[in-house]
C-alpha cells in the first residue's frame, strides 16, 4: 500500500495505490483511489509510467483524453468511469505484456487539490496447479501440472504426514516452453507416494505462489488448489 499526498494551493488530497501483478496475455488492474469530489467536471486522472514519454491514460472532464497517450498503451487502457466520482481511479490494462512492468504514477487533480502515488507493477505468468495420480507409472506417483509460469518458478513438494521432509530426491520437475516462447508449462512428478496422506505441490516465483493439494485414500481422491499474488512492499 502506498499513500501519497499532494502539494496544492488549497490542500493536498490523499491518493492511495496498491502494488500488484499482471498475468501476461490477460487483463490486469492498477489500483488507485483518492479522496472523492462531488462533481465529475473537476476530476482529472493521469496515469504515467517511468521511462515512458507519453501518458498511459488520461481522464478529464468526464471523458478519456487520449491525444497524448503513448503508443504502447493505445487501445489497452480504461478507467472504471462509473466509479471515478466515488474516488476510484484504478486502471484496467488489457492484454498485459512483459514490458508493462515498472513504476507507475497515479496523479489526481480535483476541485479540492492535487495528489499522487506510485505503484510497482510486476508482470509474469502464473496459473493454478492441478495434482493427479499418475496411473501410468510403475509405482504410486503424483503428477503436478501448471500450464503457464514466468519467470521460471521453484517447485517444492510437501506432505502432511512427513512434515519437513525433503522430497527433492524423489521428485522430478521439468519446464516446457509454451508456443509463444515466453511462458512455460510446469510439470513435477513425485514418486513413492503413500496412501492416506495429503501431498502439496507448491509453485512459486517472485510474482505468485500457488499450491495444489491432493489427498489420496483407498476410497477417494480429494483435490484443492489456490493461488496468491506476492505484492511487493510499499516504498
Amino acid at each position: 500500500l502506498i499513500i501519497g499526498f499532494g502539494i496544492s494551493g488549497r490542500h493536498s488530497i490523499t491518493v492511495t495505490t496498491v502494488a500488484s501483478a499482471g498475468n501476461i496475455g490477460e487483463d490486469g488492474i492498477l489500483s488507485c483511489t483518492f479522496e472523492p469530489d462531488i462533481k465529475l467536471s473537476d476530476i482529472v486522472i493521469q496515469w504515467l509510467k517511468e521511462g515512458v514519454l507519453g501518458l498511459v491514460h488520461e481522464f478529464k472532464e468526464g471523458k478519456d483524453e487520449l491525444s497524448e497517450q503513448d503508443e504502447m498503451f493505445r487501445g489497452r487502457t480504461a478507467v472504471f468511469a462509473d466509479q471515478v466520482i466515488v474516488g476510484n481511479a484504478s486502471l484496467r490494462l488489457k492484454n498485459v505484456q512483459l514490458t508493462d512492468a515498472g513504476t507507475y504514477k497515479c496523479y489526481i487533480i480535483t476541485s479540492k487539490g492535487k495528489g499522487n502515488a506510485n505503484l510497482e507493477y510486476k508482470t509474469g505468468a502464473f496459473s493454478m496447479p492441478e495434482v493427479n495420480v499418475d496411473y501410468n507409472a510403475s509405482s504410486e506417483t503424483l503428477r503436478c501440472e501448471a500450464p503457464r509460469w514466468f519467470p521460471q518458478p521453484t517447485v517444492v513438494w510437501a506432505s502432511q504426514v512427513d512434515q519437513g521432509a525433503n522430497f527433492s530426491e524423489v521428485s522430478n520437475t521439468s519446464f516446457e516452453l509454451n508456443s509463444e516462447n515466453v511462458t512455460m508449462k510446469v510439470v513435477s512428478v513425485l514418486y513413492n507416494v503413500t496412501i492416506n496422506n495429503t501431498y502439496s505441490c507448491m509453485i512459486e516465483n517472485d510474482i505468485a505462489k500457488a499450491t495444489g493439494d491432493i489427498k489420496v485414500t483407498e476410497s477417494e481422491i480429494k483435490r484443492r488448489s489456490h493461488l496468491q499474488l506476492l505484492n511487493s512492499k510499499a516504498s
Epitope: P36, I38, L40, S41, K63, D82, I85, V86
Partner: antibody, heavy 117, light 107 residues
Framework: QVQLVQSGAEVKKPGASVKVSCKAS????????MHWVRQAPGQGLEWIAA????????DYNQKFKGKAKITAVTSTSTVYMELSSLRSEDTAVYYC??????????WGQGTMVTVSS | EIVMTQSPATLSLSPGERATLTCKAS??????VAWYQQKPGQAPKLLIS???YRYTGVPDRFSGSGSGTDFTLTISSLEPEDFAVYYC?????????FGGGTKVEIK
C-alpha cells in the same frame, strides 16, 4: 448495512433556526461525502450542500449560502444542517444522502420542517 | 447552473407497457447522470448511476442510456410497483441539479 437515521419532525416560527441531524452507520463515515437535499410539498428535489467528514470540506449551492450551514462530528458519525432565518418557503422534507459506491445510493428517511406562524 | 429538463411531465400507461422517460441537460454532462424512483411518503431510491449502470438489486426491466446532453430511462414492461415519480440528476458540476420529475401513472 449502510443506514442514515435523521432527527424527527420540527415546527418552527418564521425567523427562527432549526438544526437537523443525520446519523450514519455501516460504512467509513470519513471517506464519503454527505449531502442534503430538500423537497417542498408536491415539488421536486433540490440540492442544498455537501460535506466531506474526512476533512470538513464543504460545497454549497449558492442559493443556500447564508441559509444553511453543515457540520460533521466524526466521533458520532453525525452530520448536522442548521437552517437560519426560516421562512414559510423553507417548509419541506429535508433528506441526507450519501455517495458510497454510486451517486446518492443511500438516503435518510427525511425530516419534515414546517415553518408556520 | 446546469438545467435538467424531463419529459413528459406525466406518462399514463398500463401494466406491461413500455415506458420511455427522457432527460435533457442544458450543457454536456458526459455520463454524469443518475435516475431515482420516488413513491409518496418515501425517500428517493437510486435506479441508474452514471447514465447506464443499474444499481444493485434494481430489476433488469430498468435500463438507462445516453451521454452528453440526452438521457433516457426505459422500463421495458411496467409492473404495478413501478408507478411512481422518476427524477434524473446530474453530478457533472455544482450546484448538483435534478430534473422536475416524470410521474408514471396507471392509465
Amino acid at each position: 448495512q449502510v443506514q442514515l437515521v435523521q432527527s424527527g419532525a420540527e415546527v418552527k416560527k418564521p425567523g427562527a433556526s432549526v438544526k437537523v441531524s443525520c446519523k450514519a452507520s455501516g460504512y467509513t463515515f470519513t471517506s464519503y461525502w454527505m449531502h442534503w437535499v430538500r423537497q417542498a410539498p408536491g415539488q421536486g428535489l433540490e440540492w442544498i450542500a455537501a460535506i466531506y467528514p474526512g476533512n470538513s470540506d464543504t460545497d454549497y449551492n449558492q442559493k443556500f449560502k447564508g441559509k444553511a450551514k453543515i457540520t460533521a462530528v466524526t466521533s458520532t458519525s453525525t452530520v448536522y444542517m442548521e437552517l437560519s432565518s426560516l421562512r414559510s418557503e423553507d417548509t419541506a422534507v429535508y433528506y441526507c444522502t450519501t455517495t458510497v459506491a454510486h451517486y446518492f445510493d443511500y438516503w435518510g428517511q427525511g425530516t419534515m420542517v414546517t415553518v408556520s406562524s | 447552473e446546469i438545467v435538467m429538463t424531463q419529459s413528459p411531465a406525466t406518462l399514463s400507461l398500463s401494466p406491461g407497457e413500455r415506458a420511455t422517460l427522457t432527460c435533457k441537460a442544458s450543457q454536456d454532462v458526459s455520463f454524469a447522470v443518475a435516475w431515482y424512483q420516488q413513491k409518496p411518503g418515501q425517500a428517493p431510491k437510486l435506479l441508474i448511476s452514471s447514465a447506464s449502470y443499474r444499481y444493485t438489486g434494481v430489476p433488469d426491466r430498468f435500463s438507462g442510456s445516453g451521454s452528453g446532453t440526452d438521457f433516457t430511462l426505459t422500463i421495458s414492461s411496467l409492473e404495478p410497483e413501478d408507478f411512481a415519480v422518476y427524477y434524473c440528476q446530474q453530478h457533472y458540476n455544482t450546484p448538483l441539479t435534478f430534473g422536475g420529475g416524470t410521474k408514471v401513472e396507471i392509465k
